[in-house]
Amino acid sequence: ITRQSLDPQRRAAPQQKRSSPTEGLCPPGHHISEDSRECISCKYGQDYSTHWNDFLFCLRCTKCDSGEVEVNSCTTTRNTVCQCEEGTFREEDSPEICRKCRTGCPRGMVKVKDCTPWSDIECVHKESGTKHTGEVPAVEKTVTTSPGTPASPCS
């Protein structure tokens, strides 16, 4: 997901650190002045830049949505890292929302992988070991298990 923006309304506060651009670019944690003469530091906890750049404004820090936890807070050189809450995960094809992990596998299948913030539980057929990734059919009896514990950040 890209939840970042250059904010043309915000101007650098006078107390912000300034330096000269190198080859027309400013280092991570800074943006460039409109006359290209100065590099102005981003505001800690408010905005950031991750690369050498000539942004007129630093990028706004992401605010984690409800249903997400903040794994790393925003610094001047790194955006906030948000992660789905325990028992939910973020799918690649719908990264904007945290989906509930399945609570168990369909009959005849066993769980081989716990729920993590970036993947649902994984079930395989007892005999063949073939993966099953679909939703649990409503008529199937499920074996309930507790969701996995978040292990590392997913951005």
Epitope: P8, E23, L25, S36, W52
Partner: nanobody
């Protein structure tokens, strides 16, 4: 919010020309340099060209040097890519990009960008 709108793509014969335009609808590109990238079918996005809107300094990928020309009209908040002597290998979706990002200050080729247009398709075929 920065929004980039490209236009000018189309079908052209080898050796032909096209001019792409990129307008910033939010009244700002949000950065001094604005560039063009392209993505050929089944390939990754590659840098094509960039321009410094303040002083007009230009940057080109080796594959387009001498054939493509980037320019800007600051009064219209628009950047252009004039593409001449087009080849079949130039066939791609062309993206306008702003907020270019570089790994080192001396780099001429950006590794990415913050803002992207929707892209305009350029097809070079006889």
């Amino acid at each position: 919010e920065v929004q980039l709108l490209e236009s000018g793509g189309g079908l052209v014969q080898p050796g032909g020309s096209l001019r792409l335009s990129c307008a910033a609808s939010g009244r700002t590109f949000g950065s001094i340099r604005v560039g063009w990238f392209r993505q050929a079918p089944g390939k990754g996005r590659e840098f094509v060209s960039a321009i410094n809107r303040n002083d007009g300094t230009t940057y080109y990928a080796d594959s387009v040097k001498g054939r493509f020309t980037i320019s800007r009209d600051n009064s219209k908040n628009t950047v252009y890519l004039q593409m001449n002597s087009l080849r079949p290998e130039d066939t791609a979706v062309y993206y306008c990009a702003a907020g270019l990002q570089y790994n080192r200050s001396a780099d001429r080729v950006p590794v990415g960008a913050v803002y992207w247009g929707q892209g305009t398709l350029v097809t070079v075929s006889s």
